[in-house]
């Protein structure tokens, strides 16, 4: 049967793809696996292969993939076979804009906002979960509260500021009872008086590779707090930065590849090239996070001619400190993330 392309079709004459992977291209049963599982580089998942036989290091963005050598599911990657129609034998690992997320066993759709508990509001963006605290930690002005302290109050989700005055009698910090800085009170106050507020960006949702960071801001016509998001990449997963630490040093705060590069997202390529800086790593227990950064707008062009833009974290400088938390606890950093809002916008 001859193929007659429909009006919207490009020329899809099948062209053979070479499998550059050393992995088996197809499944063989019964399974034959090496005696011990492979050791995967930092950030690469150890998964069961597509044959449901052996452990393998998942293929990463841009790698060839087959029914046996599958793409990293934890990074929202899938095997795009569109370049090998109609054989569907060898594809390329691509990232779909709009993959859902799983948090604590619950699946959320791309773009969906949800509250896993009363303290945080989260959004699923392209496979990554970004959260912002609902309990806003705006310190009371030092002028009338030199010694503020946060206390738990029964029946309230958020801790509230109280003021230790000279008589050591705690009192609520907010004069004329403006809601004592709990989340609901603040929102009402914003709406009444429209005091512009933008929270700091939350930490990147991944310690390496593509993640998402969110913040809330009421700088809009309705003066209503809305969640903004940006993509972030603190460090590449496929580079072992430890090897770049100079002799006698314990940390490399900033890592910058020599060559400029184009960003890729879901198979789409940025319209210009960039030379980004990444945060480095330490030999000891310290971790490195951005402290001078900004948000840039990156335009992407897709193979089908469509384009889109995304806000992206641009790192200028990083610092390394000891307040490291479990990288899998996405809420941990929100507890103690430094407020660098004056230098990190």
């Amino acid at each position: 049967t001859a193929l007659s392309p429909a009006p919207t079709t490009m020329d899809f004459t099948p062209a053979p793809l070479e499998d550059t992977s050393s992995r088996p291209q197809f499944c063989k049963w019964p399974c034959e696996c090496p005696p011990s599982p492979p050791r995967c580089p930092l950030g690469v998942s150890l998964i069961t292969d597509g044959c449901e036989c052996c452990k393998m290091c998942a293929q990463q963005l841009g790698d060839n993939c087959t029914e046996a050598a599958i793409c990293d599911p934890h990074r929202g990657l899938y095997c795009d076979y569109s370049g090998d129609r109609p054989r569907y034998a060898i594809g390329v690992c691509a990232q779909v804009v709009g993959v859902g997320c799983v948090l604590d066993g619950v699946r959320y759709n791309n773009g969906q906002s949800f509250q896993p508990n009363c303290k945080y509001n989260c959004t699923c963006i392209d496979g990554a979960v970004g959260c912002t605290p609902l309990c806003l930690r705006v310190r009371p002005p030092r002028l009338w509260c030199p010694h503020p302290r946060r206390v738990s109050i029964p029946g309230h989700c958020c801790e509230q500021w109280v003021c230790e005055d000279d008589a050591k009698r705690p009192r609520k910090t907010a004069p004329r009872d403006t809601g004592a800085f709990d989340a609901v009170g603040e929102v009402e106050a914003w709406h009444r008086n429209c005091i512009a507020y933008t929270s700091p960006w939350s930490p990147c949702s991944t310690s390496c590779g593509l993640g998402v960071s969110t913040r809330i801001s009421n700088v809009n016509a309705q003066c209503w707090p809305e969640q903004e998001s940006r993509l972030c990449n603190l460090r590449p997963c496929d580079v072992d930065i430890h090897t770049l630490i100079k002799a006698g040093k314990k940390c490399l705060a900033v890592y910058q590849p020599e060559a400029s590069m184009n960003f890729t997202l879901a198979g789409c390529i940025s319209t210009r090239s960039y030379q980004p800086k990444y945060c480095g790593v330490c030999m000891d227990n310290r971790c490195c996070i951005p402290y001078k950064s900004k948000t840039i707008d990156v335009s992407f062009q897709c193979p089908d001619g469509l384009g889109f833009s995304r806000q992206v974290l641009w790192i200028n400088a990083c610092f390394c400190n000891l307040s490291c938390r479990n990288p899998n606890d996405i809420f941990a950093d929100l507890e103690s993330y430094p407020d660098f809002s004056e230098i990190a916008n």
């Epitope: 049967t1 193929l3 392309p5 429909a6 919207t8 079709t9 490009m10 899809f12 099948p14 197809f26 029914e67 899938y78 095997c79 795009d80 076979y81 569109s82 129609r85 109609p86 054989r87 569907y88 034998a89 779909v96 993959v99 089908d304």
Partner: antibody, heavy 118, light 106 residues
């Protein structure tokens, strides 16, 4: 597990059109092409064409060009095949097929019987 | 157009027999060939793909061989469940199917 569930049987008059749906589940709908294959009553399998649910691109077999239209609704993970100007020889079962390697483990729909009769 | 020709059209055999079905392509399809089994009222399902790769869950009595234009499906010892219609399919240049081989009880 991967499932392709098709709409129910249809009876149409010659010259009319029929639209068959195919709802995908158990995998990410936009990641794989959907092909359509028909089996005229008592006959073999005949490929009609394909559609890429990610961008809506299509390719049709010459025999069906001008009569077939393949579309999708990604919000409900559903592909559609519409065949117009129906004739009696279009009577048969229409299958949607997930486009992975020879559909190995990828599944076919259960089929939709279309009867064209005056 | 790639034309696929299967033979025989009907194969009469008994349980335990070895059954062989051949498929010829009008031009080379390399090893981009699949074999399907179909039972009445059911959708086809893949037995063999890429000429010789056994699909998951398919009994090992099924095997495929060949490349280029000549292909063979072999059932080493027919079981009662194997009496069905078998189709070859090339997928090098889109999809074309053979006309089918009905394996019936002798």
């Amino acid at each position: 597990q991967v499932q392709l569930v098709q709409s129910g049987a249809e009876v149409q008059k010659p010259g009319a059109s029929v639209k068959v749906s195919c709802k995908a589940s158990g995998y990410r709908f936009i990641n794989n092409d959907i092909h359509w294959v028909r089996q005229a009553t008592g006959q073999g399998l005949e490929w009609m064409g394909w559609m890429d649910p990610n961008n809506g691109k299509t390719g049709y077999a010459q025999k069906f060009q001008g009569r077939v239209t393949m579309t999708r609704d990604t919000s409900i993970s559903t592909a559609y095949m519409e065949l117009s100007s129906l004739r009696s020889e279009d009577t048969g079962v229409y299958y949607c097929v997930r486009g992975i390697i020879a559909a190995a483990g990828g599944g076919w729909g259960q089929g939709t019987l279309v009867t064209v009769s005056s | 157009d790639v034309v696929m020709t299967q033979s025989p059209s009907t194969l009469s055999a008994s349980v335990g027999d070895r059954a062989t079905i051949t498929c010829r392509a009008s031009q080379s399809v390399d090893t981009w060939l699949a074999w399907y089994q179909q039972k009445p009222g059911k959708a086809p399902h893949v037995l063999i793909y890429k000429a010789s790769n056994l699909n998951s869950g398919v009994p090992s009595r099924f095997s495929g061989s060949g490349s280029g234009t000549e292909f063979t499906l072999t059932i080493s010892s027919l079981q009662p469940d194997d009496f069905a219609t078998y189709y070859c399919q090339q997928y090098k240049t889109w999809w074309t199917f053979g006309q089918g081989t009905k394996v019936e009880i002798k």
